[in-house]
């Protein structure tokens, strides 16, 4: 039975050329986290595997950095980076938990962090 919840950084914004940390946290479950995937739409950005550690997709190596923790840092942001990002927790025995973050990359310097919110 899937009892866990994922807390994410929610809706966030950042400046073009800057960087942003995407963070998710899985709670309310004793399930073992075997892997966390970071995806943008259907593109795999990075994997953090319990045995192997981090793997960054080759096409994102220049602009994606692992961490902090199970989070992901996006660097040298462009307006094209605006969109949905997903953290997918692969766990045993629960299965798959997904958290969603919406990132807006702004031209100006009025970028502000949105509030944190829960995704069941």
């Amino acid at each position: 039975m899937m009892t866990g919840t994922i807390e994410t950084t929610g809706n966030i914004s950042a400046e073009k050329g800057g960087s942003i940390i995407l963070q998710c946290h899985l709670s309310s479950t004793t399930a073992q986290v075997t892997q966390v995937n970071w995806e943008q739409q259907d593109q795999l950005l990075a994997i953090c595997n319990a045995d192997l550690g981090w793997h960054i997709s080759p096409s994102f190596k220049d602009r994606v950095a692992p961490g902090p923790g199970l989070g992901l840092t996006l660097q040298s942001l462009t307006v094209n980076d605006t969109g949905e990002y997903f953290c997918i927790y692969h766990t045993y025995p629960d299965g798959t938990y997904t958290g969603r973050i919406f990132l807006e990359v702004l031209e100006s310097s009025v970028a502000e962090h949105g509030a944190r919110f829960q995704i069941p």
């Epitope: 899937m2 073992q32 075997t34 892997q35 995937n37 259907d42 795999l44 994997i47 595997n49 319990a50 045995d51 192997l52 793997h55 692969h90 045993y92 025995p93 629960d94 299965g95 798959t96 997904t98």
Partner: antibody, heavy 119, light 107 residues
């Protein structure tokens, strides 16, 4: 080319033991989680067990927990399934399969090895 | 465990036709459903995963759709090599479970 070759199947009496092997080639074995899946004579597929890339984590279906042990030797590029206290319902074709790097499905399968449990 | 009901269990079609195979889960599995092709003498082939993602090397004549509990595999412009057994499998929670299979035969 990615290849998985199972061996070790055969006829065994109820309560007996058997050890299956799966030899992997054509890819970096130590990077991938691996699974065993079986197919009954009625052609039903059932996930049996899984092991993480480094072997630190093992998972089993309730039907085999406590009786089957999945293991791997990354130096030998080989996956194992040790089966004990075998029952007639364990009769099946046993396949080893590679889990995708993103953990979503099983992207390469072997041809399988047949296990028959009968007195 | 998540139960997967696959239909039809048998399907006869002619080359050139487009067919659909359905899988229904007894509880929501989000988008996490995969489709496999099984042919005698060959190893099982992953076609689609996460509901609609086409596995690398698989022709676009294969497509998947669905979310939650209801999923569909569509095969367009059937060719002789497409006649085979097809299975769906949920990969949302353990134990991973499979549908009962669909045998696609030439009419």
């Amino acid at each position: 080319e990615e290849q998985l070759v199972e061996s070790g199947g055969g006829l065994v009496k109820p309560g007996g033991t058997l050890k299956l092997s799966c030899a992997a080639s054509g890819f970096t074995f130590s990077t991938y989680a691996m699974s065993w899946v079986r197919q009954s004579p009625e052609k039903r597929l059932e996930w049996v067990a899984e092991i993480s890339s480094g072997g630190s984590y093992t998972y089993y279906s309730d039907t085999v927990t406590g009786r089957f042990t999945i293991s791997r030797d990354n130096a030998k590029n080989t996956l194992y399934l040790e089966m004990s206290s075998l029952r007639s319902e364990d009769t099946a074709m046993y396949y080893c399969a590679r889990k995708t790097l993103d953990y979503y499905a099983l992207d390469y399968w072997g041809h399988g090895t047949s296990v028959t449990v009968s007195s | 465990d998540v139960q997967i009901t696959q239909s039809p269990s048998y399907l006869a079609a002619s080359p050139g036709e487009t067919i659909t195979i359905n899988c229904r889960a007894n509880k929501t599995i989000s988008k996490y459903l995969a489709w496999y092709q099984e042919k005698p003498g060959k190893t099982n082939k992953l076609l689609i995963y996460s509901g609609s993602r086409l596995q690398s090397g698989i022709p676009s004549k294969f497509s998947g759709s669905g979310y939650g509990t209801d999923f569909t595999l569509t095969i367009s412009s059937l060719e002789p090599e497409d006649f085979a057994m097809y299975y769906c499998q949920q990969h949302n929670e353990y134990p991973w479970t499979f549908g009962g299979g669909t045998k696609l035969e030439i009419k």
